[in-house]
């Protein structure tokens, strides 16, 4: 699996690298990871009171 | 289900060592970075250290640099802290975290999500 | 290191209150702000990630604004397992860190 570059310390590491679909860059880290999918909730019909929060959909586990 | 259990904790001497593990369960760390953040007694959360999944990268708080050293054992799904030259101020709970990413446009937006229950690190002659 | 202030460091509030807390970081962190709720003895609990977005299983009463340097974290309207002390922090740089908490008490 491709992760990132592996060698440098976290405040060194270099600019993002491409991953695989089933993860995304962690600029924290400077690593990919794995990624669950972010979703935003369809609009609420009109009238309801508040906007939904947006949510997401957990990571495989 | 989920779950991160630290072990490893209790009452040492300045100066000392002691080497804290994180046990995950219901996921593999080597898909998450983990993290270890400290609350001293009536204080704060204060972050202290990370591995990425690899084990190939690491951060340090600077107040732990030099001391501490984190790791990861994907075999055992298992992060550590080893702490070294403790001193009177790093008394505190000790807490593993995984952190959770979502894809926002290839770039994670994320936080800790599963915490452990805490381990007390006591330091005192 | 990025500094992450909030603002106020405590707060009495009652039941159904509209509650406002501020994170304020010392450069700009875009949306990589989340929010945690802790209770005493316990682990903190993450409540909203990317300044925003609401984690799974967490009230829709928690809302989360901000991006830049200003972030607020909002409970509409409080409920008794709300009173706890919540935390800020940031995880656009290395290393990631915490705002000094806000303790909100029953009034």
């Known amino acids: 699996m491709r992760r990132g570059p592996r060698s440098l310390r976290g405040r060194d590491a270099p600019a993002p690298t491409p991953c695989v679909p089933a993860e995304c860059f962690d600029l924290l880290v400077r690593h990919c990871v794995a990624c669950g999918l972010l979703r935003t909730p369809r609009p609420k019909p009109a009238g309801a009171s508040s906007p939904a929060p947006r949510t997401a959909l957990q990571p495989q586990e | 289900e989920v779950q991160l259990v630290e072990s490893g904790g209790g009452l040492v001497q300045p100066g000392g060592s002691l080497r804290l593990s994180c046990a995950a369960s219901?996921?593999?760390?080597?898909?998450?970075?983990i993290h270890w953040v400290r609350q001293a007694p009536g204080k704060g959360l204060e972050w202290v250290a990370w591995?990425?999944?690899?084990?190939?990268?690491?951060d340090y708080a600077d107040s732990v640099k030099g001391r501490f050293t984190i790791s990861a054992d994907t075999s055992k799904n298992t992060a550590y802290l080893q702490m070294n030259s403790l001193r009177a101020e790093d008394t505190a709970v000790y807490y593993c975290?995984?952190?959770?990413?979502?894809?926002?446009?290839?770039?994670?937006?994320?936080?800790?999500?599963?915490w452990g229950q805490g381990t007390l690190v006591t330091v005192s002659s | 290191d990025i500094q992450m202030t909030q603002s106020p460091s405590s707060l009495s509030a009652s039941v159904g209150d509209r509650v406002t807390i501020t994170c304020r970081a010392s450069?700009?962190?875009?949306?990589?702000v989340a929010w945690y709720q802790q209770k005493p003895g316990k682990a903190p609990k993450l409540l909203i990630y990317?300044?925003?977005f609401l984690y799974s299983g967490v009230p829709s009463r928690f809302s989360g604004s901000g991006s830049g340097t200003d972030f607020t974290l909002t409970i509409s309207s409080l409920q008794p397992e709300d009173f706890a002390t919540y935390y800020c922090?940031?995880?656009?740089?290395?290393?990631?860190?915490f705002g000094q908490g806000t303790k909100v008490e029953i009034k």
């Open positions: 975290a995984r952190r959770v990413c979502y894809n926002r446009l290839g770039v994670c937006a994320g936080g800790m999500d599963y």
């Open positions: 219901g996921f593999t760390i080597s898909s998450n970075s």
């Open positions: 591995v990425t999944p690899s084990g190939g990268s690491t």
């Open positions: 450069q700009d962190v875009s949306t990589a």
């Open positions: 990317s300044a925003s």
């Open positions: 922090q940031q995880s656009r740089i290395s290393p990631p860190t």
